[in-house]
Amino acid sequence: LEVQVPEDPVVALVGTDATLCCSFSPEPGFSLAQLNLIWQLTDTKQLVHSFAEGQDQGSAYANRTALFPDLLAQGNASLRLQRVRVADEGSFTCFVSIRDFGSAAVSLQVAAPYSKPSMTLEPNKDLRPGDTVTITCSSYQGYPEAEVFWQDGQGVPLTGNVTTSQMANEQGLFDVHSILRVVLGANGTYSCLVRNPVLQQDAHSSVTITPQRSPTGAVEVQVPEDPVVALVGTDATLRCSFSPEPGFSLAQLNLIWQLTDTKQLVHSFTEGRDQGSAYANRTALFPDLLAQGNASLRLQRVRVADEGSFTCFVSIRDFGSAAVSLQVAAPYSKPSMTLEPNKDLRPGDTVTITCSSYRGYPEAEVFWQDGQGVPLTGNVTTSQMANEQGLFDVHSVLRVVLGANGTYSCLVRNPVLQQDAHGSVTITGQPMTFPPEA
């Protein structure tokens, strides 16, 4: 019995659902009562899911797996794995037995995009040409381990005096910290690029240092210039720092985080004490770091509604404030493609191809093209609907007149994550049915 699985690993983002495709060709007269289907971990042989005696025997894998019961009779033995975790990465074997027996293994490659790096300087004030400065580039919650590259403002690679460390958290996601030590010139731009080698996703930030004396007087409050990009459901750090003077104590500090537009209180620290979250109990300071001038705010389980500007007010004797923007994002799923009509197709027929991608944010950009890369812009209708969480489902419809044969591909881009998800369908020139019958 021939069992077919994809040659390439299935790449799945942490927290999303993945389909491990597996198919066989049922003979005429085949009934599900004859089918024994077992999914197991290739290495440990641990049972994941099974179908036997005409019945789905259910998930043996943390209750996160499912078959496609309506499609089994057509030979579709694929497995749906929900809420993918780093620990799921590896090889899964699909065993199919009817009268004969066959098996094949499919690899699951787990990935998570890295956050936009934050850059910190040490020391961060009174910098003069000739000073040695340590620039730290930190990017969070990615998988697998990142590749990190530094360069100056002219694109010259900086490879000396770089130390990069990567630490996995309990979920197996990596936080990467890369430290560059440089001697300051008259001025300089230093940029750090963090690459996810599986997603081929680049996250980069840069810092421009113009050595000079800081003006005395008001408290200088520093926040990132660029918006902080956070994935829905993850935690985000809104960075804010000030430079405490010698002899500074927390009893002198008044720190207030509030929504810039509405002035709604988010979190505060006064009278030497953390006054707690006033924002749905999802915020926290970094109490151990406050004395060093780190007034950053941690926002947990980010939602679409959190997007916007947050102001960090710091008062000691003097007063200063700065606003940081939070940009929320969620990756779009791999598009599914449907045809209407979907059978007995002939050249000259008009067909409607629908490309659907789910649960992304912000609104997607959708591009269609043919098999030669020629953009298809006529007869395209795209609609995007937000669900209760504010995440968008995108449906793009292309109407085409079939030629002898043709490939039509749809690319759904998340403009913030610069994440592309694409699907394609190839329609051959003889009478055919879609999806092709096994």
Partner: antibody
């Protein structure tokens, strides 16, 4: 129009030196690094080194470090490459090129027309 | 030194054919650039920052990446594509080019 115009062809004796110029126009000369690349007859491209006309910082391919000097004259927006102790295997077309882009992606967007240097006794 | 190895060195292709050129880096690179050079001409920027087409480059050109392999694809070769193509990196010193792939039209 952004342009790099190089000096004319040179024929040199082994052991001598050659100095090739590259005049930039149409952009701020100090904003981008200028690189030098050579191509021997029928061969591929080989990087020699670069100069930052603003800071005058240079860096060289180890292979050319001892024999090459890169300089830049900001007043005339001209970069120079001098190669000494010439040997027959230095016979090549020498190109200057501007390394352009924006952080963190850069590439050679403008090339000079090339200067043929022939080393022959 | 990061060595870039292009394959094949030479390819003779019929118009309308699909062509692939692979540039394999000996270690990870921050990004890859590609240049096109025709006989007796200076190289021209062709693809920058791994997959962005330079100005005027036809959309039949594309690049895909798998690990340290960067693959340049010409979807349907045209006569004007006959040239030598070079990949280039500068993630660490020295800046290096691939040895080049020459495309000839049959």
């Amino acid at each position: 129009e952004v342009q790099l115009v190089q000096s004319g062809a040179e024929v040199k004796k082994p052991g001598s030196s050659v100095k090739v110029s590259c005049k930039a126009s149409g952009y701020s000369f100090t904003s981008y690094t200028i690189h030098w690349v050579r191509q021997a007859p029928g061969q591929g491209l080989e990087w020699i080194g670069y100069i930052n006309p603003n800071s005058r910082n240079t860096d060289y391919n180890q292979k050319f470090k001892d024999r090459t000097t890169l300089t830049a004259d900001r007043s005339t927006s001209t970069a120079y490459m001098e190669l000494s102790s010439l040997r027959s295997e230095d016979t090549a077309v020498y190109y200057c090129a501007r390394y352009s882009g924006s952080t963190p992606y850069w590439y050679f967007d403008v090339w000079g027309q090339g200067t043929t240097v022939t080393v022959s006794s | 030194e990061i060595v870039l190895t292009q394959s094949p060195d030479f390819q003779s292709v019929t118009p309308k054919e699909k062509v692939t050129i692979t540039c394999r880096a000996s270690s990870s690179v921050s990004y890859m650039n590609w240049y096109q050079q025709k006989p007796d001409q200076s190289p021209k920027p062709w693809i920058y920052a791994t997959s962005n087409l330079a100005s005027g480059v036809p959309s039949r050109f594309s690049v895909s990446v798998s690990g340290t392999d960067h693959t340049l694809t010409i979807n349907s070769l045209e006569a004007e594509d006959a040239a030598t193509y070079y990949c280039q990196q500068w993630s660490s010193n020295p800046l290096t080019f691939g040895q080049g792939t020459k495309l000839e039209i049959k």
